[in-house]
Structures are given as C-alpha cells and as structure tokens.
C-alpha cells in the first residue's frame, strides 16, 4: 500500500487506479495515505471516474476517509439515489491526513477504466465554522498559512487557552457619591473565564447602598450554590453572597464607605449578568434655618456629609459673624453630622457716622443718628463764604455700606470758597488813593520774606503773585511769611499762613524784563474763609469785556505812598486801563529797552500821573468787577512801572492774568 508523499515534502500529486487508463483488473486493493503539514488539509478531486456500479457500492469502490470518519464511498459513473460518483465534487480531509482506498471485486460484467485523481495540501481556514458550531475564537479569529490565532477587543485579554477572551475588569474604583456598575457587556452576555473586581471607595462618613436593577442572570446550578459563575460583595465588616441565578438580590445597606464587588465566570454559559445602582448616605446635619433677612441655598430635604449651603442676605443686609464682615458664607456638613461653621447674621447695612465736611456740616434727614441702609443725610456748606461743588449734598446709605450721592459718588462733596466778595462798591469816577476798610479787599495777602510784597488769595490754599516778588524764595518756600485778614501792615492780629511750594512761570527770566511775571504759592494748610479772608475770582472767558481801555480797575497794597514810606494801612486806588499801543509807546523811550511791554501785560493809570501802584505793592491784584456775576476778579498782577511811581505820561504795568488761565489751572490741578 503506497503511503504517498509526507510533509515536509511538497504535498501534491496524482493518484490512479492500477492499469489506468486501461481497465483495472479484478480483486485489486490499493491504499494511499496522504499527510499534510499541521494546519493544512488535503484537497482531492477526480478527473476521470469509471467504476462498476453496485448497490451501495458493494462491489468496486473508492473510499475516502479522514481519521475515523469516512468522507465518501464512490462507484459508478454518475450518482444515483443510493450510490455516489464524484462527478465534479472536491473532497477535503478533516485534518491533515487523507486515506484513499481502491477495491475491485472478483468479476466485472464489462471493462471499467478506473479513476484518475489529483490532490494537493491547502491551508485550513480554522476561522470558518459551520452554522451551529461554536466559533473558533471568542472575539477575533485570524487565519494564516498553517494555523490561526485569536485576539480580543479592547478591555479584554486572551486567556491561556488561547481562544477565550477574559474581561479586563479589575481595578475600577468608584469615588462619586452615586453611580452605576454592571457586568462586562451588560445587557449582552458576560465574558467567560473572567474575574472582575470593582471598588466603591467614598470618603469616611459615607455609607454605601447597593440596589440591583433591571435584570439579574448569572449561571447557576440546581443543587450546588453558585458553582460556575458568582457575584460576591465584601465590606470591611461583612461579606454578601455569592449571588447567582435569575432573581434580583435585595437592597444591601453596607454601613461602610468602602465596598469590593467580585464577579467570577467559568468557560461556559450564555448569561446576561447584572447591574447595580449604588447611592450613599451619611449622618445628616441639622436643618439650616436661615437668619432673619437671609435665605438658604440650595434648599434640600436633608443635608449629609459634603453637602453645603450658602446664606444670601436681602438687599441692604450684610453677612456678619459678630462684628466681622463676610462677602460670602458657605457651610459644609461634616462626617459627625455637624456644620463646619456656625450660622452668620444678616444685619442691616450700617454706613456709620458720615465724615465731617470741611467748611460744611451734615444733617440727618431720616432721623437723628440714623445711619443704616436707605438712611438719608444732607451735607451743606457754610453759607455766604462757601458753595458746594458739583453735587447737591444729598447722600443715601447704599447696600454696599457707603454713603453715596445722587450721582453715585462715594467721596465727600467739596465746599469751595466763594470768590470775589467785597464789602466795597465802586464809585463811578477816579479819585485819589484811599484807605481800605474791613472787607474791601479780603483777598489781599501780605508777603514778607526779605522784601515786602503782596499777593491775592485763590481758592483757600493758593496765592497768586508776581514771579519777581518771590523769585529769591523759590527754593526755600518755608522762608515766606504770609499774612492775611488784616488791614494794618504791622498789626499783630492777622491769619498766618505758610508756604508749601512756590511755582514760578517757566517763561519768566529774572533781571531780564518782566514777561511772564507770575507765580503761585501753595499754602501748607487751607485757610478759613470769612468776611476778611475771601479768595479773588479768576477771570472768565468773557472777562475781557470788563477790561477794555478806560475801564476801571482797583489796585491795593501796602506799597510806597507819596510820602515815600510803606503804607501802614492797606491803601487802594481806582485806575483806568490804558490803550496798549499808548503804553507800549510810553516805554519805548530810554532808559527802557525796546519791547519792554509785551502782549502778556496790561497798563493802567492816569496820563497826568499821581495814581499808581508802587514798590511794595508787587504781586498784588488789579481787580475788576464782573457786572454779570457781581464778583470781583483779578485782571492784572502788579509787576513794574516807571522808577518814579505815579509819573505823568508813564503807567503801571501789570501781568495780564487772562493769558495764564491754563497755566494756573494746570498747576492747581496737578498739585
């Protein structure tokens, strides 16, 4: 009996009946055993088949078998109801070996030519299975020449049997206060040969509650308790289970903050598994009662560990813990069932006593001393000498705890001194220098510091003067002795002021003419305004209409009089403004250099002389009455003139203040 080729030789070839293509003889038996490499099978088909036909192929036949299984018994030329001829069929071994047996009996009624067949080894596709058969692999099957291998979906690992996919279902830790967990693939069948461990781990103080939901189907056994697949639940104090079968287990109140759930499956079965919904509870905290004028958020039926609430106060009320203010308040429930902070109060906002207003007063409108939310106060300035700047002085205690004006300002109003008030009324004509009376020139300032000079009060902490009068003291402001509120130069009764800083116009050059002869002195304290101390107004844009040629201005000071001495009493003179060209011409002649009179100057005086300001008056104000506002304003600053004061054909020259309004405003706003 020929064996045929064996692996590792190439496995393919031809088989034929004895004597083929001639007729085969009687009483023949021939057997071929073909062997392919592992993972391969043998394919066989006939190119010629002509054997004696007999019932069930009892006489002559070709039998194909693989292992113990007969694949086919063949005879005849064509198949009948009870006999089979190969025709165009291809035959496959079940494993890697194929046995072919040819037999002829003792006689043939006519000659038969036998058979010719060809065979070859081919790869077995182990991944293809017949319907109803178990799949080769659990998840993915991969065929290759001579064999196959299995692989698994993400979340699974190949079991050591190389076919089953075990779930990678351990190490999951649930830390939320509630959640769901289930068997792998639920509600589809759970995987075989798996061991799953799930942990629920909550903060100390919580107790886990387990509820089995939807369906429960774990392989069971009628007599033995869960021998195949089972679910176990373990806490630090007890074990629950094992569970299997089709009945939903009851709720489990673990009284523990940590739970381990173990699920083990064997290699067989087709069950859908389980699903658990877990919640947690803890010792509840006392129900938070909102303080008066406050509310709790969020509102819950109960508050347990880690739950929190906040307190929000009504508008006009604020969170206070005793005397200490809080912007927000949140309390958290602790594991022992107590809140981590005590309840604060919602106290009505108290803006507190309003600040004192310099040169003003405050009046309680709502009620004496009432300073709580929505209370109203009224600020006002001392009448006659002060006026309120910008707002109306009405302030309300707002919810943020600040007194707030109707314009939303939280700063105090400002009481600004009223400027340009004088006890004096102007006469219609010019007459000689006269003694000033109390309140005539309340802006008049006496400046002592090496020489005698003058200035005019602006606001309540600035003095306007001539640059040449304070030039020597520009770096030593504290050396200036500033006096106001007096008529007598030598009187001990005056208001003393001291200089904080001296600002000389940057365009002024000492000993080189008097252009830009203007300076400001900042006082180190505000002075109190009264009938004897009142600031002069700065000129309005329209002021030029009150300072035309021949309009009358008034100069005042303690400068030299006709007798050649400094005046003891404050003197004043009413003098007309002189045409600018006329004045310029008067100072073109020697000894005056050309261009002495500039556009920054104005001139005043009589052509006939006799009325003038003089040495000692320097820095003082030449003032004019604004007939529209009925306030006096400074038009000029006593600057220079002829060597002989009051000389005919010569005039007093004054710094033209209106040209310097931006400079004055900038200095005052910056400093």
């Amino acid at each position: 009996t020929p064996l045929g080729p064996k692996w590792p030789e190439p496995v393919f070839g031809r088989l034929a009946s004895p004597g083929f293509p001639g007729e085969y003889a009687n009483d023949q038996e021939r057997r071929w055993t073909l062997t392919a490499p592992p993972g391969y099978r043998l394919r066989l088909y006939f190119t010629h088949f002509d054997l004696e036909l007999s019932h069930l192929c009892e006489y002559d036949f070709v039998k194909l078998s693989s292992g113990a299984k007969v694949l086919a018994t063949l005879c005849g030329q064509e198949s009948t109801d009870t006999e089979r001829a190969p025709g165009k069929d291809t035959f496959y071994s079940l494993g890697s070996s194929l046995d072919i047996t040819f037999r002829s009996d003792y006689s043939n009624e006519k000659p038969f030519t036998g058979f010719e067949a060809f065979y070859a080894a081919e790869d077995i596709d182990e991944c293809q299975v017949a319907p109803g058969e178990a799949p080769t692999c659990d998840h993915h099957c991969h065929n290759h020449l001579g064999g196959f291998y299995c692989s698994c979906r993400a979340g699974y690992v190949l079991h050591r049997n190389k076919r089953t996919c075990s779930a990678l279902c351990s190490g999951q830790v649930f830390t939320q206060r509630s959640g769901e967990l289930s068997s792998p693939e639920y509600p589809r069948p759970y995987p075989k040969l798996s061991s799953c461990t799930y942990s629920i781990s909550l903060e100390e103080g919580f107790s886990v509650i387990l509820d089995f939901v939807e369906s429960f189907d774990v392989e069971t056994h009628p007599e033995t308790l869960c021998p195949y697949d089972f679910l176990k639940i373990q806490t630090d104090r007890e074990e629950h289970g094992p569970f299997c079968g089709k009945t939903l287990p009851h709720r489990i109140e673990t009284k523990s903050n940590t739970v381990t759930i173990t699920f083990v499956t064997d290699e067989s079965g087709d069950h859908t598994g389980w699903k658990i919904h877990y919640t947690s509870t803890a010792q509840p905290c006392p129900y938070p009662m909102a303080p008066p004028n406050g509310h709790v958020s969020p509102v819950q039926a109960k508050y347990i560990l880690k739950d929190s609430f906040s307190i929000f106060c009504e508008t006009g009320y604020e969170l206070l813990q005793g005397h200490l203010p809080l912007k927000s308040f949140t309390a958290v429930c602790q594991k022992d069932g107590s809140w981590d902070r005590p309840m604060p109060a919602c106290s009505i906002v108290d803006c507190g006593p309003p600040d004192d207003l310099p040169s003003g007063r405050v009046e309680y409108i709502t009620g004496p001393g009432v300073t709580t939310y929505k209370a109203v106060i009224q600020y006002s300035c001392e009448e006659t000498f002060y006026t309120m700047k910008v707002n109306d002085g009405k302030y309300v205690c707002e919810a943020d705890g600040f007194w707030t004006s109707s314009k939303g300002e939280k700063s105090l109003p400002v009481c600004e001194p009223v400027c340009g008030l004088s006890a004096r009324t102007t006469g219609g004509r010019i007459y000689g220098g006269q003694k000033a009376k109390p309140g005539d020139f309340p802006w008049q300032v006496l400046i002592l510091g090496g020489t005698t000079a003058a200035g005019a009060l602006l606001y309540d902490n600035w003095v306007l003067t001539a640059a040449h009068a304070v030039y020597e003291q520009k770096h030593d402001a504290s050396a200036l002795d500033i006096r106001m509120g007096t008529l007598k130069r030598l009187s001990p009764h005056y208001t003393q002021a001291w200089s904080e800083a001296v600002f000389i116009h940057e365009g002024y050059t000492h000993d080189a003419g008097f252009d830009n002869d203007i300076a400001l002195i900042k006082l180190n304290n505000k002075v109190v305004i009264n009938s004897n101390i009142t600031p002069i107004c700065l000129p309005r844009k329209e002021a030029e209409s009150f300072m035309r040629t021949d309009d009358i201005g008034t100069a005042s000071g303690w400068g030299l009089t006709q007798r050649g001495f400094l005046a003891r009493n404050l003197m004043y003179v009413d003098i007309p403004i002189v045409d600018h060209q006329k004045c310029t011409a008067a100072y073109e002649k020697p000894p005056y250099p050309r261009g002495s009179v500039t556009a920054n100057m104005l001139c005043a005086g009589l052509e006939s002389g006799g009325k003038d300001s003089c040495r000692g008056d320097s820095g003082g104000a030449l003032v004019f009455l604004d007939s529209e506002t009925e306030r006096w304003f400074v038009g000029g600053i006593v600057s220079w003139g002829s060597m002989n004061c009051g000389e005919a054909g010569q005039y007093g020259v004054y710094t033209k203040v209106i040209n310097y309004i931006p400079w004055i405003e900038n200095i005052i706003s910056d400093f």
Epitope: Q321, G322, H323, L324, P325, L326, K327, S328, R341, P342, D400, G401, F402
Partner: antibody, heavy 115, light 107 residues
Framework: DVQLQESGPGLVKPSQSLSLTCTVT?????????WNWIRQFPGNKLEWMGY???????SYNPSLKSRISITRDTSKNQFFLQLNSVTTEDTATYYC????????WGQGTSVTVSS | DIVMTQSQKFMSTSVGDRVSVTCKAS??????VAWYQQKPGQSPKALIY???YRYSGVPDRFTGSGSGTDFTLTISDVQSEDLAEYFC?????????FGSGTKLEIK
C-alpha cells in the same frame, strides 16, 4: 498658601505719623473677609486697632478713631495703617491679620516711638 | 468695650494631663470667641473660632466650648510643644477685644 507681611519704619519720633504696609500673597483682599491691624504692647497685651473689609469699608477701635486711618491698594494687594500724633505709648509690635474663618497673621513688625 | 477676663495668669501642668483655660466676657458675646496660642518670639496662631470650631491643622486635643459670657479652651493630652501663652478674643462687637493671656507652664 496665604501669607501676610508687615513693613515700615522701626523708629518713629513722637508727634509724627506711623505708616505701615501689609502685603498679602495667596489671597485677594477684595475676595472676602476683614483685614485687620492688631498691636501687642510690651508685656504681651493685645489691642485690635481696626480693619478694612473686602469692600473697602473700615471699622476702627473708638480709642484710636481720631488718629487712625486704614486704606488699601487693591492693585498691589496691600493694605496700610496710618497712626497720627504718636507717643511713646504707641511702642509695640504691629501685626496685620485676617481673622475668623480664614485666620492668618503676619510675623509682626516692632515699632519704637522715641525722640 | 467688652472686657475679656482670663483670671489665671499662669497655669502649671504635666505632659499627658488635661488642662482647661477659662475666659469670661463682661457681656454676652454669643459664640463669637476665638482662642489663640502664642509661643515666645512668634505671632499668635489661631486654634478655635466661633467658641468651638477648630481650625484645620489644629490637633484635636484642643477643644473649645461655651457661649454667652463663659468660655473654655481645653487641652486634653498636654504635650511639651503646648508650652505657650493662650489668649481669648471676642469679635462680637466693636472694638474687638482680647483677654490678658494665660501662660501654660509644663512641670
């Protein structure tokens, strides 16, 4: 971590003003709470001077009200103490602190009032 | 002003002992009381607020109790590092006031 740090001159002349700065790191002074000045006299007696709250409102010890001012600079997360017309009685260690639920103190700065 | 009286200027105790420091307010301060520990050369450190609430990081051997006018700080198992001066403070009303302090000495 919340930290408070006091700074300012260690020596002040009588009748002058004492000015101290508290610099806060790790928490915004506008977020919440009251930001306090507390002083400890030789002998360890503690005195609360006043606070400025998260909103900028102030509360002062009435015994100091005429000469104390507490202000702040939110852009620098600092608050300040100014105590006017000091005398030798104001010699102490000065602390800035946030009190109540958040409680942190600076390390303190020693101030001597002496001519 | 509310006066906070710590009647005992000094208290002597041994390691492992239980000791109570008391503080009395001159008028009702509800539970708006804090306790501070101050070690030599250091700034005060808060232990308790709202009479009985312990700050995080404070050992649980420190407990506070009381309301209204009478307050107590108890150290249940005195350790050598508890050698310090202890101050109570009320923050119920303006001005906030402190007790004069109780110095704890370890025998």
């Amino acid at each position: 971590d919340v930290q408070l740090q006091e700074s300012g001159p260690g020596l002040v002349k009588p009748s002058q003003s004492l000015s101290l700065t508290c610099t806060v790191t790790g928490y915004s002074i506008t977020s919440d709470y009251a930001w306090n000045w507390i002083r400890q006299f030789p002998g360890n007696k503690l005195e609360w001077m006043g606070y400025i709250s998260y909103s900028g409102r102030t509360s002062y010890n009435p015994s100091l009200k005429s000469r104390i001012s507490i202000t702040r600079d939110t852009s620098k997360n600092q608050f300040f103490l100014q105590l006017n017309s000091v005398t030798t009685e104001d010699t102490a260690t000065y602390y800035c602190a946030v009190l109540y639920a958040l409680d942190y103190w600076g390390q303190g700065t020693s101030v001597t009032v002496s001519s | 002003d509310i006066v906070m009286t710590q009647s005992q200027k000094f208290m002597s105790t041994s390691v492992g002992d239980r000791v109570s420091v008391t503080c009395k307010a001159s008028q009702n301060v509800d539970t708006n009381v804090a306790w501070y520990q101050q070690k030599p050369g250091q700034s005060p450190k808060a232990l308790i607020y709202s009479a009985s609430y312990r700050y995080s990081g404070v050992p649980d051997r420190f407990t506070g109790s009381g309301s209204g006018t009478d307050f107590t700080l108890t150290i249940s198992d005195v350790q050598s590092e508890d050698l310090a001066e202890y101050f109570c403070q009320q923050y119920n009303s303006n001005p906030l006031t402190f007790g004069s302090g109780t110095k704890l000495e370890i025998k």
